[in-house]
């Protein structure tokens, strides 16, 4: 949903659904700022490079962030 | 259950304005942009607009920019659609629709109130 | 603007099968999703395919969806035909999400 026009935020609906990390190509948190007044989290799937909104105040959420922060974690030396 | 309910169609004369209402209940409304999508009578679907879950962003077809705006309150659960300057091309059942997007897979239509505009 | 065009009527027996193809113009039609709705007289569109290929629950084996880069086309296909499949049939995608692109609409009817 992310668009190349200028408006306020990307997201057009937000999921409390966590995705599959293993669908996953990257997933971007952007803070809040002077053009979205929120946390917006959005992962980009490797299937056709597909963005979906996640809810940052999603339990299942917060602990897709925490895992996908670990993995990084051991991947860097 | 899932339902969209809409109300407020009716007919009106050229020139003239009418509201929309859809009352959303059975998910969650306030995760979820919500859209008009409008087909005339005998013809195809033609989708109007959409509402971002906040209400933050607001998109039209353009046929109908600049005289209608989409709005909703979530404290209600309730969705609108204020439409200004009516034309006859206007008539047709107007949905209220939770359709696939990038946070939702599935889609919930509501049954459609028809608007007639006609002298 | 993304343009999605449809055959304006299609008709096939009972147990037979039938495609109906749904072509972009001004973009291309694998950049994103592509959806079916199956609409019957009186009633409300319901979703019979979604990206591309995924039917819904409920929605039967005999519906599938495909799409061919090479023509820039989708295409919904209806196989082992039924009577209650007789409805109009849209194809939809983006311009770009979330800005819905439906196609014309095609009439099925089983003869």
């Known amino acids: 949903v992310p668009l190349s026009r200028t408006v306020r935020c990307t997201c057009i609906s937000i999921s409390n659904q966590p995705v599959n990390p293993r669908s996953l190509e990257k997933l971007e948190i952007i803070p809040a700022s002077q053009f979205c007044p929120r946390v917006e989290i959005i992962a980009t799937m490797k299937k056709k490079g597909e963005k979906r909104c996640l809810n940052p105040e999603s339990k299942a959420i917060k602990n897709l962030l925490k895992a996908v922060s670990k993995e990084r974690s051991k991947r860097s030396p | 259950q899932v339902q969209l309910v809409e109300s407020g169609g009716g007919v009106v004369q050229p020139g003239r304005s009418l509201r929309l209402s859809c009352a959303a209940s059975g998910f969650t409304f306030s995760n979820s942009g919500i859209h008009w999508v409008r087909q005339a009578p005998g013809k195809g679907l033609e989708w109007v607009a959409v509402i971002s879950y906040d209400g933050s962003n607001k998109f039209y077809a353009d046929s109908v920019k600049g005289r209608f705006t989409i709005s909703r309150d979530n404290s209600k659960n309730t969705l609108y659609l204020q439409m200004n300057s009516l034309r006859a091309e206007d008539t047709a059942v107007y949905y209220c629709?939770?359709?696939?997007?990038?946070?939702?897979?599935?889609?919930?239509w509501g049954q459609g109130t028809l608007v007639t505009v006609s002298s | 603007n993304f343009m999605l065009t449809q055959p304006h009527s299609v008709s096939e027996s009972p147990g037979k099968t039938v495609t109906i193809s749904c072509t972009g113009s001004g973009g291309s039609i694998d950049r994103n999703y592509v959806q079916w709705y199956q609409q019957r007289p009186g009633s409300s569109p319901t979703t019979v395919i979604y990206e591309d290929n995924q039917r819904p629950s409920g929605v039967p084996d005999r519906f599938s969806g495909s799409i061919d880069s090479s023509s820039n086309s989708a295409s919904l296909t209806i196989s082992g035909l039924k009577t209650e499949d007789e409805a109009d049939y849209y194809c939809?995608?983006?311009?770009?999400?979330?800005?819905?692109?439906f196609g014309g609409g095609t009439k099925l009817t089983v003869l």
């Open positions: 939809q995608s983006y311009d770009p999400l979330p800005v819905w692109v």
């Open positions: 629709a939770k359709l696939r997007d990038n946070a939702e897979y599935t889609d919930y």
